[in-house]
């Protein structure tokens, strides 16, 4: 029982994790202006995201621009769009593998192949975690990097936006949750032995022996 | 007193490079970075890109991608830009200057300019 | 990349005139403007930095002011010694970009 509800707490984790990977992904604001140096009332502050860019006027105005060629964009952030759908793409696929594997369904009798399946989609979600986690630390790095680069002019300079820390928290919760999928598995797994020494023992030769005869010291 | 002591006239071919140095002093070198400007005759300045001299980092205006290369000796607290492919166009006043700390900026010291003649 | 216009390339002055030079970029440069003066045969020396601070050592004559696109320098009574050519450069955005010049001279 106790399983079942580790095993809920974490598919619920990871689907959080998903939809808040989700939001960082599409959001534009994975880079925001950093406007520094003489205090200076902004007119506008620029947002950038990996499919867009937004300016906000000081009125409250805000025009979106999608980017326009694939090629021409850096490397970094063709990098990490690539990622963060992939990272996307891999948590679902995590999540078909629960399904079939979980308590609940009947896509698998076996509980022990119930189990390998749970197992499996904790690991998948483990890996979309550390996918959504490489983009964002990616990018934060950068924006640290060019703000404390005296080279970079001030209007280059960038802060790190509301979908990073979005995306840190949704690979926290897919790490965290496939973490769980994969604790629960040990019981799981457990009924894997029993199961298999059931079918043994009914193919074993009629004659048995009394439980004095069987040495104590293999019982834990 | 921060003092940039570059150095003296250059006359070279078309074709050939040449590399011009900055010696600086009255400041520690890796605190500040150091940019190039040049300036054609009778005309504005043109900013032609900046060194760190704490960990060798460059950047370059556009313009002057795969003309000019900036390079530092940290031992001799001086800084280098060799210019390549020299024509007509790159003879002009070369000028060396100290990029301000942080929150200023802008060029503070200048050297005193190297001349560069390209003529055949 | 920004482009900064000074309208006037040369002024020709009176002693103890007042001198406006005025710099406007194509887009907001958030204060972030210097302004050097240029001597003949001589590298550029910094007035002023940050649009309207200036900089040790040079005389209060000198002042700067304005915001947003458009800066001015002024020098309130001009000087045999303020015979130079007078630049402006954003320090804003890269590749940063100087002002044409203005000359100024004495009538």
């Known amino acids: 029982m106790a399983s079942a509800g580790m095993q809920i707490l974490g598919v619920v984790l990871t689907l959080l994790g998903w939809v808040n990977g989700l939001v960082s992904c599409a959001l534009p604001m994975w880079k925001v202006t950093a406007f520094i140096g003489n205090s200076i009332v902004v007119a506008q502050v620029v947002w950038e995201g990996l499919w867009m860019s937004c300016v906000v006027q000081s009125t409250g105005q805000m025009q979106c621009k999608v980017y326009d060629s694939l090629l021409a964009l850096p490397q970094d952030l063709q990098a990490a769009r690539a990622l963060c759908v992939i990272a996307l793409l891999v948590a679902l696929f995590g999540l078909l593998v629960y399904l079939a594997g979980a308590k609940c369904t009947t896509c698998v009798e076996e509980k022990d192949s119930k189990a390998r399946l749970v197992l499996t989609s904790g690991i998948v979600f483990v890996i979309s975690g550390v996918l959504t986690l490489i983009p964002v630390c990616w990018t934060a790095h950068a924006i640290i990097r060019d703000f404390y680069n005296p080279l970079v002019a001030e209007a280059q300079k960038r802060e790190l936006g509301a979908s990073l820390y979005l995306g840190w928290a949704a690979s926290g919760l897919l790490l965290l949750g496939g973490g769980l999928l994969c604790c629960t598995c040990p019981s799981g797994g457990s009924q894997g032995p029993s199961h298999y020494m059931a079918r043994y023992s009914t193919s074993a030769p009629a004659i048995s022996r009394g439980p004095s005869e069987y040495p104590t010291k293999n019982y834990v | 007193e921060v003092q940039l002591q570059q150095s003296g006239p250059e006359l070279v071919k078309p074709g050939a490079s040449v590399k011009i140095s900055c010696k600086t002093s009255?400041?520690?070198?890796?605190?500040?970075?150091m940019h190039w400007v040049k300036q054609s005759h009778g005309r504005s300045l043109e900013w032609i890109g900046g060194i760190n001299p704490n960990n060798g980092d460059t950047i370059y205006n556009q313009k002057f991608k795969g003309k000019a290369t900036l390079t530092v000796d940290k031992s001799s607290s001086t800084a280098y830009m060799e210019l390549r492919s020299l024509t007509s166009e790159d003879s002009a006043v070369y000028y060396c200057a100290r990029r301000g700390g942080y929150g200023n900026f802008n060029f503070d010291y200048w050297g005193q300019g190297t001349t560069l003649t390209v003529s055949s | 990349d920004i482009q900064m216009t000074q309208s006037s390339s040369s002024f020709s002055v009176s002693l103890r005139d007042r001198v406006t030079i005025t710099c406007k970029a194509s887009e907001d440069i958030y204060n972030r403007l210097a302004w050097y003066q240029q001597k003949p045969g001589n590298a550029p020396r910094l007035l002023i930095s940050g649009a309207t601070s200036l900089e040790t050592g040079v005389p209060s004559r000198f002042s700067g002011s304005g915001s947003g696109k458009d800066y001015t320098l002024s020098i309130t009574s001009l000087q045999t010694e303020d015979v130079a050519t007078y630049y402006c450069q954003q320090y804003w955005s890269s590749p940063y970009t100087f002002g044409g010049g203005t000359k100024v001279e004495i009538k």
């Open positions: 009255g400041y520690t070198f890796t605190e500040y970075t």
